[in-house]
């Protein structure tokens, strides 16, 4: 029997845990090992998350939202680990969790503040609307509200339209920029301050190329070293714009080092690819090949867009036949 004198009250301390939507997290709690361990995890001081005592879980009064989503590190309880393993966190799980741990001779209470972030990989799109050209930075699902900044030729732009739609658990955001008639380079940065995650989209317009029918054209596409890390998975897509929509010519996946080519006249240099140069060749040009060609290099952290405008003109032979 443990008399009163053994009682130790350890005041509440607070920790912050940041989780990502739909991922698993651990809410930490530790105590000085002792006999007769009782562990109660509660949410916002009201909802029962997890209870353990007399050597086993007791989840009869667990709030239904936590069913099959919580567990303890059972082999480590005797070593003073009362941490909670929490599966598939949602934004509704955000808030304060309290852990009560009692033993025969002491008690501690820990507070853990859970914050949940969302950052589905953003995209940078190039769109033509009638006679206007737009760059659009968008993120389908993000939380909390991100910081979006635009730069033109490395100079911040103050105008920053943001189209925002909020769902129950996150924001969907579009930030369009009218770049009609501009030859500048543009950069869009989306930052999730909670997850400390930043994504950058960069758009570069190359000088127009004039080619004759039946010739071939080389279009450069080399990533900017500031963003590009060859160790990170990325995808390269070459596409051509026709009547306002892009059709994919070829793409390359760094994870499998696979190249898929949809246009027989398109060629990639394997050696150059190994040196992170994704320039391409298009052989035997015809008049319908005139248009805009887009190289898109994308990873979780960036999108690099390079636009080439190609004008294919009739050759002398063809012209004289007409």
């Amino acid at each position: 029997i443990f008399p009163l004198a053994f009682f130790i009250y350890v005041p509440m301390n607070e920790q912050i845990v940041i989780g990502r939507l739909d991922e698993d997290i651990i809410l930490p709690s530790s105590f000085e090992r002792g006999s007769e361990v009782v562990i109660h995890w509660k949410y916002q001081d009201s909802y029962k998350v997890h209870s353990y005592y007399k050597g086993s879980d007791h989840l009869e009064s667990q709030d239904p939202r936590y069913a099959n989503r919580t567990s303890l590190f059972y082999n480590e309880i005797q070593n003073g680990n009362a941490s909670l393993f929490f599966r598939r966190v949602s934004l509704l799980d955000e808030g304060i969790y309290t852990c009560y741990v009692g033993t025969a001779i002491q008690v501690i209470t820990n507070k853990v503040v859970l914050k949940v972030g969302v950052f589905l990989t953003p995209v940078m799109k190039y769109e033509k609307r009638n006679t206007n050209s737009f760059l659009i930075c968008s993120v389908l699902s993000v939380y909390p509200r991100p910081i979006i900044t635009w730069k033109m030729d490395n100079t911040p732009i103050s105008e920053n339209n943001m189209e925002e739609t909020g769902s129950l658990d996150s924001f969907s955001i579009n930030s369009p920029l009218n770049i009609t008639g501009s030859n500048s380079s543009y950069e869009c940065t989306i930052e999730n301050s909670l997850l400390k995650q930043t994504w950058t989209g960069r758009w570069t317009m190359k000088d127009g190329l004039h080619k004759m029918q039946s010739e071939h054209v080389s279009l450069s596409c080399q990533p900017v070293n500031d963003y590009f890390s060859p160790n990170q998975d990325f995808k390269v897509t070459w596409s051509r714009m026709k009547s306002g929509t892009f059709s994919v010519l070829a793409y390359y996946l760094s994870s499998s080092q696979n190249t898929i080519i949809n246009e027989s006249r398109f060629s990639w240099n394997k050696e150059l690819i190994n040196q992170s140069d994704f320039s391409m060749n298009l052989m035997d040009l015809n008049l319908s090949d005139s248009g805009e060609y887009l190289c898109n290099i994308s990873s979780d952290e960036y999108t690099l867009l390079t636009i080439h405008t190609v004008h294919v003109e009739p050759s002398q032979e063809t012209a004289s036949h007409n």
Partner: antibody
């Protein structure tokens, strides 16, 4: 019905002994710490003693330490308070109370009370 | 030793009025403080625990606030059945469970 019923109170002379009992029903008795609280006539509440579900943690107020003994019988859903060497200042209504934290002893509140039993110590 | 001091000792109010009861601890008890209501000839009843959480079945007119050493029980609009004695209790110090001296809320 969830309830606590105290018994065993009465008139007793100073220096004598008395044993109080508390019968619990309507809840899982062996999942809860149990407590004795007393209230002298016209006075406030005074915590007397507490016992964990397993009887491994026991606590007493300084005013009764060495004279009173708390115990429980989980098989009988019963709590006891053995009071020895009674004094006039022990005169009070004695309440049995249930601890609020399942299986927890420390930091628990008293979320269920009995109606009390009166102990009068007088010659 | 932690001592809880309740004030005022008596509060004379009319039904419908707001009641504000104070409980001061001689040293910090964090948020480990409860409020109980006791009517004549009855056992106490838990109203508020952990300083601000209402116990099961307690009406919303009862609310608790405070942490550390200063705590308040507020009854937003007194009902006839609310006239009683109210006790605060700390559960985190030495002695482990201590009650304040009580505040009597009586009809004016």
């Amino acid at each position: 019905e969830v309830q606590l019923v105290e018994s065993g109170g009465g008139l007793v002379q100073p220096g004598r002994s008395l044993r109080l009992s508390c019968a619990a029903s309507g809840f899982t008795f062996d999942d809860h710490a149990m407590f004795w609280v007393r209230q002298a006539p016209g006075k406030g509440l005074e915590w007397v003693s507490g016992i964990s579900w397993s009887s491994n943690s026991i606590a007493y107020a300084d005013s009764v330490k060495g004279r009173f003994t708390i115990s429980r019988d989980n098989a009988k859903n019963s709590l006891y308070l053995q009071m020895n060497s009674l004094r006039a200042e022990d005169t009070a209504v004695y309440y049995c109370a249930k601890g609020s934290i399942v299986a927890g002893f420390w930091l628990g509140y008293f979320d269920l009370w009995g109606r009390g039993t009166l102990v009068t110590v007088s010659s | 030793e932690i001592v809880l001091t309740q004030s005022p000792a008596t509060l004379s109010l009319s039904p419908g009025e707001r009641a504000t009861l104070s409980c001061r601890a001689s040293q910090s008890v964090s948020s480990y403080l409860a409020w109980y209501q006791q009517k004549p000839g009855q056992a106490p009843r838990l109203l508020i625990y952990d300083a601000s959480n209402r116990a099961t079945g307690i009406p919303a007119r009862f609310s608790g606030s405070g942490s550390g050493t200063d705590f308040t029980l507020t009854i937003s609009s007194l009902e006839p059945e609310d006239f009683a004695v109210y006790y605060c209790q700390q559960v985190s110090g030495n002695p482990l469970w201590t009650f304040g001296g009580g505040t009597k809320v009586e009809i004016k």
